[in-house]
Interface confidence: low
């Protein structure tokens, strides 16, 4: 903002707007009776250059003409693009104390002439929209540049609009505010953009288009779907469109999908039948429109319609497993387990399961419905039993899945051989085996079953299992496998009416146990000592314990202790040792060993045997 100059004037030659690389002469003149009051001859005019309001140069040495005390002319060169402020000041050199006094100032703009606008593109959104064009302005001019958009067409149609670019705003789009109607579909229109600033002007090449070239239909609206007879797989998609639309594109996908199903529909008139939908699935539907079969542009996609298809009756086979436990001499408890159907099989919300237990010969049948994925019943130990389970939703039930109830580990000849369990990584275990050696009936399938070896796991937690075809001899188990936990793994071989099994323990990752077993008692029986202990608490085992070690040494001895290594069995909590001298006091302790190493020692107990030495 240049204020009124009271002391004098500043002028620029050739002009205050110059092309990049040009020089300019700036003249600073004092008004009559202005200047240093006592000594006019001591008037010194200086010119200061400011860029972004920062003083960058005193142009004292650039004087090309000096009319002592009245005016000075300075030549300025190498001006950078944009605006530069020059302020002329009066320096009364006889007074060293007074700072120079501002006289007047001028702003010089350095820029370039505009390039011809290029890449003109025009659109009209919808049949009732208005024509708007955009273009590429080319290099920045650093000057206020006016742009004029001119359109001409049939019947002497002409129309123009203007805008400008400067350092605060950019002009590369204009809306002409006119509407082209479908009755002009075959007509040709021409647009041109002209750019002008203080250093020159330029014009674009003419850009020609027709109605169909530029009109983009509005996206379809009011989308809805009607499912025929509440079908989960067939539906009619309906929508509203502009009147001239002849072609639609439909896309739809389940919400968790990454790829769209695409359909082209000609002359659909706002309606299309879909026949390949998945029941009980959240879908997203979108539609786009075009005004001409071969030319023109597609509209934007419509807003999404999100809806869930109706249910249909479940399909697929339930994966069933069971456990048998004898209660007494004539009763057994059967616990049935099954896995939930996946969504594409359930085809709706499963409301309940129909469970049937049937004794084959006596035709005794127990039936029940449950909302859980397990069911337990007490039945006689006699007879041949079969179980079946089906899943039901609001539209119906799946076909029942049958399984024969056999003695799962009853036939030694069916027991798989050389079962091994190796940790593959933090969350899975590779189980391998060899087929039974002398099976008298063919193996129909293998079942690999596992559960955590923790107190109460049999009653608290259902088993996990995998069904393996009869020609496979390995399984990678990962469901619910956690590191530092020991699992009991059983491999069952099942024939039509018999079962055999082998068992092993395994873990996916292990560490040495946190502590050793706690010795609870030492008793002497028939010249042998029985050591009793409590097992290490489950969280402190940190994997499968392979064996326990019992250490002992004479109380005050510095010699290495003796030790006895016992294979780990969950059911065992005492062990005899017989190599201790009578009437000698010993110190005893225990440790536990996993594949990762040995635990710290458990508690120490002292004991002095009384009997004869062996």
């Amino acid at each position: 903002n240049i204020d009124v100059c009271k002391l004098g004037t500043v002028t620029v030659q050739p002009a205050p707007v110059i092309p990049l690389g040009s020089a300019a002469n700036i003249s600073c003149s004092l008004n009559p009776k202005q200047g240093c009051s006592h000594y006019p001859s001591s008037n010194e005019l200086i010119l200061l250059k400011f860029v972004n309001d920062v003083l960058v140069e005193n142009l004292h040495g650039k004087k090309v003409h000096d009319h002592t005390g009245h005016s000075s002319t300075f030549q300025v060169t190498n001006l950078s693009l944009g605006m530069t402020l020059f302020v002329c000041k009066l320096n009364c050199s006889n007074s060293q104390k007074k700072p120079p006094v501002p006289v007047c100032g001028v702003e010089i703009s350095v820029g370039v002439a505009p390039e011809p606008p290029q890449n003109i593109s025009c659109v009209q959104e919808g049949e009732n929209g208005t024509v708007a064009c955009s273009w590429n302005s080319g290099k920045v001019t650093y000057l206020k540049t006016n742009y004029t958009l001119q359109l001409s067409g049939p019947n002497n149609l002409t129309c123009q609009k203007q805008c400008f670019s400067d350092n605060r705003q950019n002009c590369n789009r204009l809306d002409l505010g006119i509407n082209l109607s479908p009755d002009l579909a075959e007509s040709r229109f021409i647009v041109r953009v002209t750019a002008i600033n203080d250093l020159g002007n330029s014009s674009s090449l003419p850009h020609t288009f027709t109605f169909l070239d530029i009109v983009i239909p509005l996206p379809p609206w009011d989308i809805r779907i009607n499912f025929l007879n509440a079908s989960g797989s067939r539906g009619t998609l309906q929508w509203e469109d502009e009147g001239q639309v002849v072609l639609n594109q439909l896309r739809y996908q389940p919400l968790n999908s990454t790829s769209w199903n695409m359909v082209n529909a000609t002359n659909a008139k706002g309606k299309y039948d879909l026949r390949d939908l998945r029941p009980f699935t959240e879908y997203e539907f979108q539609i786009s429109s075009k005004l001409h079969l071969s030319g023109g542009s597609w509209s934007n996609w419509s807003e999404s319609l999100r809806t869930r298809t109706p249910e249909e009756e479940p399909v697929g086979i339930l994966d069933i497993w069971y456990m048998k436990q004898d209660i007494d001499y004539d009763r057994q408890q059967i616990s049935l387990f099954w896995k939930s159907l996946n969504p594409s099989e359930a085809r709706g919300k499963i409301l309940h399961y129909q469970v049937t237990l049937q004794e084959v010969t006596k035709k005794t049948t127990l039936q029940n419905t449950t909302r859980h994925t397990s069911w337990t019943r007490v039945i006689p130990r006699t007879g041949a039993w079969t179980a079946s389970v089906s899943a039901a939703n609001s539209k119906g039930a799946s076909a029942p899945t049958h399984i024969n109830i056999v003695d799962l580990c009853g036939t030694g000849l069916l027991a798989p051989h050389q079962v091994s369990a190796k940790s593959e990584n933090m969350d899975n275990i590779l189980v391998t085996w060899q087929p039974p050696k002398k099976a008298d009936s063919a193996v129909r399938e293998y079942i690999v079953e596992w559960r955590a070896l923790q107190p109460g796991s049999i009653t608290k937690f259902p088993p996990h299992w995998l069904r393996i075809p009869p020609d496979n001899m390995s399984a990678l188990i990962s469901e619910n496998i956690k590191p530092y936990i020991c699992y009991e793994i059983r491999v069952h071989a099942l024939s039509e009416s018999q079962g055999g099994c082998s068992s092993i323990r395994g873990d996916s990752k292990h560490k040495a146990p946190v502590s050793g077993p706690h010795i609870t008692a030492i008793t002497e029986k028939k010249e042998r000592l029985f050591i009793s202990w409590t097992h290490i608490p489950f969280p402190e085992q940190r994997g499968c314990i392979l064996h326990y070690r019992i250490y002992w040494k004479e109380r005050d001895s510095t010699a290495q202790p003796e030790l006895c290594e016992i294979q780990y069995r969950r059911s065992q909590n005492s062990h005899p040792i017989s190599s201790l001298q009578p009437r000698v006091t010993y110190v005893l302790w225990m440790t536990a060993v996993t594949a990762a190493g040995e635990s710290p020692q458990g508690n120490e107990r002292e004991f002095c045997p009384q009997g004869k030495a062996n």
């Epitope: 204020d3 920062v54 006289v103 007047c104």
Partner: nanobody, 120 residues
Framework: QVQLQESGGGLVQAGGSLRLSCAAS????????MGWFRQAPGKEREFVAG??????QYRDSVKGRFTISRDDAKNTVYLQMNSLKPEDTAVYYC???????????????WGQGTQVTVSS
Amino acid sequence: QVQLQESGGGLVQAGGSLRLSCAASGRTFSWYRMGWFRQAPGKEREFVAGWYGVLTQYRDSVKGRFTISRDDAKNTVYLQMNSLKPEDTAVYYCAASLGGNYRSYEYDYWGQGTQVTVSS
């Protein structure tokens, strides 16, 4: 040597106006570039508006709302503040310099400041 004293601050509703004055002592007031700065709690002092002979300048966020003017006969510089916003709340300082622009360390003389509070 110049002494500066601001006045005119106060509490005002958003959208309201205030006029700050800065009175200077000394006979050479007309030689000095005058500036207004402000400092909100916990923030650095920032340039608001300045007058340098033929040139006035403003920070972008106050352009069109604030106007700086001066009366050399009264040795006073003014800041007219219209359409005030809550973010304009700060202590406003008047400053004088023989050659500075908009950096606060270039100013030689400062007033004590006046509090402006804009409530929403």
